[in-house]
Amino acid sequence: APVPPGEDSKDVAAPHRQPLTSSERIDKQIRYILDGISALRKETCNKSNMCESSKEALAENNLNLPKMAEKDGCFQSGFNEETCLVKIITGLLEFEVYLEYLQNRFESSEEQARAVQMSTKVLIQFLQKKAKNLDAITTPDPTTNASLLTKLQAQNQWLQDMTTHLILRSFKEFLQSSLRALRQM
């Protein structure tokens, strides 16, 4: 499911519960995705020892994965709500091609990979409603994404395993950083 249990507007199981605010819904959605990533990481970590490797050992890769930096305004120092929100949405849009790549990378967690992908789409929609400056958000070029996907899928098995691990780790870190920032807003 792309939305955590109890989040669907049609859910009437708890009629006395206060409806979630926009911020609470976003918070819960991120936590839901992080739980999904955790499940996917369990499968990849069981298959290889990459999870124990230091970041430096895995740093030499050609992936251009979104990453939070001081200039993005999401850290405690230099915090800027609007700049940060634009970075979060832009970063999530950039991650979408990598989440598409993950779709055929899991045996026992195939549904979980799909749930992470769909939940991220929903999260982007939630965040776009919250953002005031949508013009500042750049959408990745579909043609560039298509050729990147082809290139990633053409890698040998070891590189594909490495790519899977790096995507999951980077996406986890990006979401955790986003959550910390959103909780300050």
Epitope: K55, M68, E173, S177, R180, R183, Q184
Partner: antibody
């Protein structure tokens, strides 16, 4: 053995500076969030600050501007730079590791602590 | 800024007693709360995280409950090695806070 070992504590004069170290062994520090917590004699635990996997940091309001957390991944060591020290900074300083697998901060591995005394 | 208030600050109990310590957050922190045990001259030890999940190697006589703003640590049958100071800690947000920990509860022998 998986452990954290703090060092660098000692006697320092008010207004002085000190750099504490936290050396990790048995695991790669760069894969984890690491925090500093202090405890004044006979008092409770006081959170100082944290460094996340991306070198993002956060500090307690009272520590901003005086304390800085950094790390050297090649040495597998974390640092706490403390400037403009005051008598009330006298405490045992602990570093602690968060496994960073989740979104909430929780500290499941602690060092033995190093004592910092600020006095003239 | 989130503040953590722990009560009582100290209590006296006997071996075999059921002990309850409470912790209150100044705003909702979901279930993002941990409990630690500290003995004199030693580093704190994680007992419970996510409000109710027992950390590895912690005896089942320790349990945690709560969500939102109100949390409880319970020791079902106090053992001699349980006399120590207990702290709660919020892990929800470490920004714009003075302290992530509660003030502590010292459990003493009656």
């Amino acid at each position: 053995e998986v452990q954290l070992v703090e060092s660098g504590g000692g006697l320092v004069q008010p207004g002085g500076s000190l750099r504490l170290s936290c050396a990790a062994s048995g695991f790669s520090l760069s894969n984890y969030y690491v925090t500093w917590v202090r405890q004044a004699p006979g008092k409770g635990l006081e959170w100082v600050g944290i460094i996340y996997g991306s070198d993002e940091t956060a500090y307690a309001t009272w520590a901003i501007g005086r304390f800085t957390i950094s790390r050297d991944n090649s040495k597998n060591t974390l640092y706490l730079q403390m400037n403009s020290l005051r008598a009330e900074d006298t405490a045992v300083y602990y570093c602690a590791r968060d496994d960073s697998s989740d979104w909430d901060a929780k500290f499941n591995l602690w060092g033995q602590g190093t004592l910092v005394t600020v006095s003239s | 800024a989130i503040q953590m208030t722990q009560s009582p600050s100290s209590l006296s109990a006997s071996v075999g007693d059921r002990v309850t310590i409470t912790c209150q957050a100044s705003q909702s922190i979901n279930n993002e709360l941990s409990w630690y045990q500290q003995k004199p001259g030693k580093a704190p030890k994680l007992l419970i995280y996510r409000a109710s999940t027992l950390a590895s190697g912690v005896p089942s006589r320790f349990s945690g409950s709560g969500s939102g703003t109100d949390f409880t640590l319970t020791i079902s049958s106090l053992q001699p090695e349980d006399f120590a100071t207990y702290y709660c800690q919020q892990g929800y947000s470490l920004r714009n806070i003075d302290n992530a920990f509660g003030g502590g509860t010292k459990v003493e022998i009656k």
